[in-house]
Interface confidence: low
Amino acid sequence: GTDSGSEVLPDSFPSAPAEPLPYFLQEPQDAYIVKNKPVELRCRAFPATQIYFKCNGEWVSQNDHVTQEGLDEATGLRVREVQIEVSRQQVEELFGLEDYWCQCVAWSSAGTTKSRRAYVRIAYLRKNFDQEPLGKEVPLDHEVLLQCRPPEGVPVAEVEWLKNEDVIDPTQDTNFLLTIDHNLIIRQARLSDTANYTCVAKNIVAKRRSTTATVIVYVNGGWSSWAEWSPCSNRCGRGWQKRTRTCTNPAPLNGGAFCEGQAFQKTACTTICPVDGAWTEWSKWSACSTECAHWRSRECMAPPPQNGGRDCSGTLLDSKNCTDGLCMQNKKTLSDPNSHLLEASGDAALY
């Protein structure tokens, strides 16, 4: 503790001009009291005949100092080291606006040197976040902002973000950006960014987790192209035909909107009816030919086949023997292009 009256330390010592002013090899550093653990402050100086701590403007009792002395190998000068402990109680007993501070004063024959002030603070981290991230549903490729204001703390809490319990490292995944005010930005939401996000605040006292925010990256559905129209339902006359499309271009995902509109279209259709062909009446029999045959013919024209109707079945020509005709000797064949049917004449012999 400090002792303001029982000991009086000299303001200076007799000087010897050959010795320089004390120089601090180690100055006391700012420290935080965690829970009830006292902190240790340390000074090293040379040349130094004495080193004492002063806290909040008052000398610390000599009994509370632990002093060591040794030679500095490089210079051969005498190095003095001193340390004190500061307890939580001491810090709490300091009332006022100023933080608890301590500094070292070192003496040599040349005079005194003061170290920097080291501040001792009671470390804490409040439980509640000033702002916690909120879950959201976002379209694919959109920017997402997750906000986090960590709890008040001494020292000020550091913030990191977890994605499904894994620490986000923006240097590894440049789609993530951590802002100076601890917010997380997802630049272009990917489907793989659908996850639980947690803001974690930590300092030397504790680690606090925010509530978890669920980010869902969704894809709204889009229609595929229409399929071809189906064939008309009736082969002949009036009927219906339909076509379909599907909500797969892309398919909706993670609660994205289903396509609006019809997946099915129906329209009336008329197919011209096919007309099957039919034969005309047979022609009259021809006169008896030189081959002793006569012929008759017909055509598939009553009506002709139309719109994919069936052709007539059967023969175009019909023939049969005849005995009433005069059959010529050395007769020509029907296949001869000069052949012709001869009428019976008086020059021909009767059979």
Partner: antibody, heavy 115, light 106 residues
Framework: EVQLVESGGGLVQPGGSLRLSCAAS????????MHWVRQAPGKGLEWVAS????????SYADSVKGRFTISADTSKNTAYLQMNSLRAEDTAVYYC????????WGQGTLVTVSS | DIQMTQSPSSLSASVGDRVTITCRAS??????VAWYQQKPGKAPKLLIY???SLYSGVPSRFSGSRSGTDFTLTISSLQPEDFATYYC????????FGQGTKVEIK
């Protein structure tokens, strides 16, 4: 007409590997969420893995993560499930299905893991 | 992961009965829930998507509804061909199915 046909199932020893194929016709798998769903004998349906080629996205059930890999060859309009380090509990009929609401399913292919 | 708790696991009913099957999501899944029918040895068939939309070709006696995270499949008048196992499924990745409800003849 939309059709999904699975193949590649069979008997395999524990620790072995199999590759299942799902040949799709009548639609483009590039734009469709494709799933593998399995059903162990006498049990319910269990989602295994999904791929969404449109967004280069894959997702797996915890039970198969690190062992199974889903992929798609959009030029062949076929999805695949590469199954490594197979266990007895992977024995099931494996179905492939299309869409986020699974509107079309294949007939299924049986995978038996047994020594 | 989101759990889908389906009930009952089985039920006995007669032709003409009204049948209700429910699924509760462990967290919000918006309306991204589908219902399937499966018969032994066959692949499942989609009945309802987006919680309440009837899939094309499915008879109108099937309907779906949502109340918060509770989802219901209703068969208004059970037909002989409706005896099967029914599953709900949520479409937030990772996808999960309910445990199934077997509808048997009383």
């Amino acid at each position: 007409e939309v059709q999904l046909v699975e193949s590649g199932g069979g008997l395999v020893q524990p620790g072995g590997s199999l590759r299942l194929s799902c040949a799709a016709s009548g639609f483009n798998i590039y734009y469709s969420y494709m799933h593998w769903v399995r059903q162990a004998p006498g049990k319910g349906l269990e989602w295994v893995a999904s791929i969404y080629s449109y967004s280069s996205y894959t997702s797996y059930a915890d039970s198969v993560k690190g062992r199974f890999t889903i992929s798609a060859d959009t030029s062949k309009n076929t999805a695949y499930l590469q199954m490594n380090s197979l266990r007895a509990e992977d024995t099931a009929v494996y179905y492939c299905a299309r869409h986020y609401a699974m509107d079309y399913w294949g007939q299924g292919t049986l995978v038996t893991v047994s020594s | 992961d989101i759990q889908m708790t389906q009930s009952p696991s089985s039920l006995s009913a007669s032709v003409g009965d009204r049948v209700t099957i429910t699924c509760r999501a462990s967290q919000s899944v918006s309306s991204a829930v589908a219902w399937y029918q499966q018969k032994p040895g066959k692949a499942p068939k989609l009945l309802i998507y987006s919680a309440s939309s009837l899939y094309s070709g499915v008879p109108s006696r099937f309907s779906g509804s949502r109340s918060g995270t509770d989802f219901t499949l209703t068969i208004s008048s059970l037909q002989p061909e409706d005896f099967a196992t029914y599953y709900c499924q949520q479409s937030y990745s990772p996808f999960t199915f309910g445990q199934g409800t077997k509808v048997e003849i009383k």
